[in-house]
């Protein structure tokens, strides 16, 4: 499966868990393997392109999630969601225009 599809599906599920279920732990469990995949690095040209477009924002979002896990401060989680939100919108629009 392509990275943009994995992130699109993963962020949708993370959103459902957080906003619908109020399950922060479940949200992190969905996002952690996706971040781990990014940390392993791109293997194809499409993955390289995805990493260039979204890698920095996703890494920053992961940092805010880690801060939240230590602090419990919802402001840190909001910063993470702000980044995920913008990545998701860009992925959605790009995916929509090419399919």
């Amino acid at each position: 499966i392509l990275w943009h599809e994995m992130w699109h599906e993963g962020l949708e599920e993370a959103s459902r868990l957080y906003f619908g279920e109020r399950n922060v732990k479940g949200m992190f469990e969905v996002l952690e393997p996706l971040h781990a995949m990014m940390e392993r690095g791109p293997q194809t040209l499409k993955e390289t392109s995805f990493n260039q477009a979204y890698g920095r924002d996703l890494m920053e979002a992961q940092e805010w999630c880690r801060k939240y896990m230590k602090s419990g401060n919802v402001k840190d989680l909001t910063q993470a969601w702000d980044l995920y939100y913008h990545v998701f919108r860009r992925i959605s629009k790009h995916h929509h225009h090419h399919h």
Partner: antibody
Framework: EVQLVESGGGLVQPGGSLRLSCAAS????????IHWVRQAPGKGLEWVAS????????SYADSVKGRFTISADTSKNTAYLQMNSLRAEDTAVYYC????????????????WGQGTLVTVSS | DIQMTQSPSSLSASVGDRVTITCRAS??????VAWYQQKPGKAPKLLIY???SLYSGVPSRFSGSRSGTDFTLTISSLQPEDFATYYC?????????FGQGTKVEIK
């Protein structure tokens, strides 16, 4: 067509109980999220409680915590708000609403609302 | 709790006017803000979700925007059916909170 229909409102004395119902149709109730929002006469909107129909996960406003209980019966496509130890300040129109997300965005909003049911707490 | 401070609390306008209602969150809520319209004796109706996305079936004269923690609902050309009360609401943190409402009245 998506529909939410509340019932169960009425006049109740302080300290009394009431159970509101929210009958849902036109969508997959099992995988939905239902919220109760109230509006005191001449006032604004106040969020009360929420439930995930599938998991049963719930949240409450501090003002009703310990007194109100939200539940859902997926076999009847109905959500409930059990209200105990009612106070005069609970007097309001109570609305149930579906909480949903949309394509292109991760964020959620209440896209369908019932017509509301009036709860009056008075002696 | 996150406070959503709406202004003005009421305004008078004429048909055809451009109307702007603002909502300020007490802390960051990202773009997790919706706007609702409510007419007397009726349930609220969703107009805008995610700060700037127009809900299905809502006329294009309605628009929403975000600047940091400030959110704006704009009606580009007020129509007779738009006289109502408008509420903002944040959904990123519980408890979900609404603004106190803005009543749009006929001048």
């Amino acid at each position: 067509e998506v529909q939410l229909v509340e019932s169960g409102g009425g006049l109740v004395q302080p300290g009394g109980s009431l159970r509101l119902s929210c009958a849902a149709s036109g969508f997959n109730f099992y995988s939905s999220y239902i919220h109760w929002v109230r509006q005191a006469p001449g006032k604004g909107l106040e969020w009360v409680a929420s439930i995930s129909s599938s998991s049963g996960s719930t949240s409450y406003a501090d003002s009703v915590k310990g007194r109100f209980t939200i539940s859902a019966d997926t076999s009847k496509n109905t959500a409930y708000l059990q209200m105990n130890s009612l106070r005069a300040e609970d007097t309001a129109v109570y609305y149930c609403a579906r909480f949903s997300s949309y394509y292109y965005t991760l964020y959620w909003a209440m896209d369908y609302w019932g017509q509301g049911t009036l709860v009056t707490v008075s002696s | 709790d996150i406070q959503m401070t709406q202004s003005p609390s009421s305004l008078s306008a004429s048909v055809g006017d451009r109307v702007t209602i603002t909502c300020r969150a007490s802390q960051s809520v990202s773009s997790a803000v919706a706007w609702y319209q409510q007419k007397p004796g009726k349930a609220p109706k969703l107009l805008i979700y995610s700060a700037s996305s127009l809900y299905s079936g809502v006329p294009s004269r309605f628009s929403g925007s975000r600047s940091g923690t400030d959110f704006t609902l704009t009606i580009s050309s007020l129509q007779p059916e738009d006289f109502a009360t408008y509420y903002c609401q944040q959904s990123i943190h519980y408890p979900l909170t609404f603004g106190q409402g803005t009543k749009v009245e006929i001048k």
